[in-house]
């Protein structure tokens, strides 16, 4: 279990559409971050699909991966579990009709470990800061 202080919110669904849709701008950076640590061909397919769902000018954040090997593996596992739960919720919402309030309150608080906490600042933020 990740301590509460090490959690951040991954907004799985957007709250401004009916039916709710995947908040791909929030999810995409996590998959980009873990691609070098996972099956790249599967992650590539996920990235492409998430990009198709993305609105044109939605901002994206940069994500860094925990430096510790164990934390890193936990981070990847958590992302995949969250994503799986997220998709499950989307399918449920599509099948169950407009119980939007209840659905969003369940999903928008889904936590994911904060990959930026406790890392050297040169390893976070933009892509070209890494050495």
């Amino acid at each position: 279990m990740v301590p509460e202080s090490n959690r951040t919110l991954l907004l799985c669904l957007t709250s401004d559409s009916q039916p709710p849709r995947l908040n791909s701008s929030a999810i995409l950076p996590y998959f980009r971050a873990i691609r070098p640590l996972s099956d790249k061909n599967i992650i590539d397919k996920i990235i492409e699909q998430l990009d198709k769902l993305k609105f044109q000018h939605e901002p994206e954040t940069e994500i860094s991966v925990p430096a510790d090997t164990f934390e890193c593996k936990s981070f990847i596992l958590t992302i995949l579990q969250q994503f799986s739960a997220c998709l499950e919720s989307v399918f449920k919402s599509l099948n169950s009709g407009p119980q939007k309030g209840e659905l969003n309150s369940k999903l928008e608080g889904k936590p994911i470990p904060n990959p930026l906490l406790g890392l050297d600042s040169t390893r976070t933020g933009h892509h070209h800061h890494h050495h």
């Epitope: 980009r32 990235i47 892509h127």
Partner: antibody
Amino acid sequence: QVQLQQSGAELVKPGASVKLSCKASGYTFKYYDINWVRQRPEQGLEWIGWIFPGDGGTKYNETFKGKATLTTDKSSSTAYMQLSRLTSEDSAVYFCARGGTSVIRDAMDYWGQGTSVTVSS
Amino acid sequence: DIVLTQSPASLAVSLGQRATISCRASESVDNYGISFMHWYQQKPGQPPKLLIYRASNLESGIPARFSGSGSRTDFTLTINPVETDDVATYYCQQSNKDPLTFGAGTKLELK
């Protein structure tokens, strides 16, 4: 399918500059590094540098600083490499190759066909 | 810079036999419990083609007769059995640290 299409062969004079292009298709250009690699005749592969189209960030091999300049045009999904102050030592085939999506460098999984640059007076 | 030393420089193998190419790094290329060592095949007049990524992962569309192993500083590319189409030069490459570096290549020929 992912493809990287490079511009045609160049014959240039010593001291001149040349700009090579690499047009990407079949994937979302802004999410993946583009690497540039040099191969001199009958020689091995040398990494020149990478550019990340998402934010324009670059990293160069020290050997190529001041020689190569990497840029991209996101609207046309094209990466460019300008080579300046050319000498006969710069005669080579130059490849572009797709890299990873993260600050953690990854393999180069798709390659352009290469552009031959010949420097001769 | 991380120096990659490939051996042998050239290799002649009979059809159907096993070919083994070695790549030694001047320092570890491991990070996050993963080895950032990759293998490419290049035929004359063609660009390199990714065969194995991160030491042991077979790239999509590459035949299973190609395999990779190793960690930290010592890596091996194995082709078993060797086929006519495998005549080429093979390069290792590390992506753990910039600058990215390649081995000098191993030329595979048929006996």
